[in-house]
């Protein structure tokens, strides 16, 4: 008799992902030295035991605290760029810009980045025919409840200057609900953020509209601003010529606004 | 390149004790979860023992469990599985290999190496 099994909303566990976590995070033990003494087998057990044989709508943050405490890591809290529905450009600036961090660079980031998972109550089964989805199932799923931790605490983390990538050619640029709207600008330090700087990234060649005046942009200021830190804006009307320009800051076609 | 180099296998009575070897070099030892595997002659590969990049987390088959243990030196490079109370049934060749880890009994290996022989008989 074939068990009845839960049919969510959402694309199952991403094929093979026991072995793509632990290989992705030897990969990165192997880059970044200063990781080197995470035990992979140690962090996979972890990242398992968040999830496996809960109620995948009943998942907490208290669930990854075995996870987290495994993979703290210090990054240069002056150096950390947010990004809101830009994750592409966002990676790629920090590819080329070494000194900066996504929460994609680091560890715990880097293991999860593009990938479903889920289990089933009461089995030590991984749920590869479906998960929950965040708006037609449960927002207490594994998937929004590790990046809800984990961007929490990489915003709280953050100090000085923030820096934000946000997609200008989206109707919200600033979107309330996104992670970066719900989770990091409410976690952002006043005693430590000095500034929250964003940079809202063109898609169109000929817009040359001044983006930071956006009433979405303009509600993430007020809400800022009542946090007790500073808000700029800056307008990245050519985002393939601002990647170039990072890359050869010499070039003499990049004293001209980007 | 990654290389893989067993030693210390050879002939041992029932009931004696033998530790093997493996040498690692082309890669980064402490970043990957090791194990030895056995073929015991005309039988399939046989997965013995895992360890973990820093060597917290072991795994061993029932078959060896409380005979066999299995350490590593992330100083030196090296993988080691030492057998006491040996059976006839242990006579095989012991292969080390290189791996992501594993999860319960799936273990998701890289690199093997060439395998030593162990002989137990009298």
């Known amino acids: 008799v074939p068990r009845w099994r839960q049919q969510w909303s959402g694309p199952g566990t991403t094929k093979r992902f026991p072995e793509t976590v632990l290989a992705r995070c030897v990969k990165y033990t192997e880059i970044h030295p200063e990781m080197r003494h995470v035990d992979c087998q140690s962090v996979w057990d972890a990242f398992k035991g968040a999830f496996i044989s809960k109620h995948p709508c009943n998942i907490t943050e208290e669930d990854y605290q075995p996870l987290m405490k495994l993979g703290t890591q210090t990054v240069p809290c002056n150096k950390i760029l947010l990004w809101s529905r830009i994750k592409d450009l966002a990676h790629q600036f920090t590819q080329v810009q070494r000194d900066m961090f996504t929460l994609e660079d680091t560890l715990l980031g880097y293991l999860a980045d593009d990938l479903t998972w889920c289990g089933e109550f009461n089995t030590s089964k991984i749920n590869y025919q479906s998960c929950p989805d965040w708006r037609k199932d449960c927002s207490n799923n594994p998937v929004s409840v590790f990046w809800k931790t984990v961007s929490r605490r990489f915003a709280e983390a953050a100090c000085d200057v923030v820096h934000v990538m946000l997609n200008g050619s989206r109707s919200k640029i600033f979107d309330k609900n996104s992670t970066f709207g719900s989770v990091e600008v409410h976690n952002l330090q006043p005693e430590k953020v000095q500034t929250l700087e964003a940079w809202v990234i063109h898609g169109g060649r000929e817009d040359s509209r001044d983006l930071c005046q956006d009433p979405t942009i303009k509600e993430l200021e007020s809400i800022i601003s009542k946090r007790n830190i500073q808000f700029s804006c800056k307008n990245i009307y050519r985002p393939d010529k601002f990647l170039q320009c990072v890359k050869n800051p010499e070039d003499s076609s990049c004293t001209s606004e980007i | 390149e990654v290389q893989l180099l067993e030693s210390g296998g050879g002939l041992v009575q029932p009931g004696g004790s033998l530790r093997v070897s493996c040498a690692a070099s082309?890669?980064?030892?402490?970043?990957?979860?090791m194990s030895w595997v056995r073929q015991a002659p005309g039988k399939g590969l046989e997965r013995l023992s895992a360890?973990?990049?820093?060597?917290?987390?072991?795994y061993y088959a029932d078959s060896v469990k409380g005979r066999f243990t299995i350490s590593r030196n992330n100083s030196n490079n090296t993988l080691y599985l030492q057998m006491n109370s040996l059976r006839a049934e242990d006579t095989a060749v012991y292969y080390c290999?290189?791996?992501?880890?594993?999860?319960?009994?799936?273990?998701?290996?890289?690199?093997r190496g060439q395998g030593t022989l162990v002989t137990v008989s009298s």
């Open positions: 082309g890669f980064t030892f402490s970043s990957y979860a």
């Open positions: 360890i973990s990049g820093s060597g917290v987390n072991t």
């Open positions: 290999a290189s791996g992501k880890g594993w999860d319960g009994n799936t273990w998701y290996e890289d690199y």
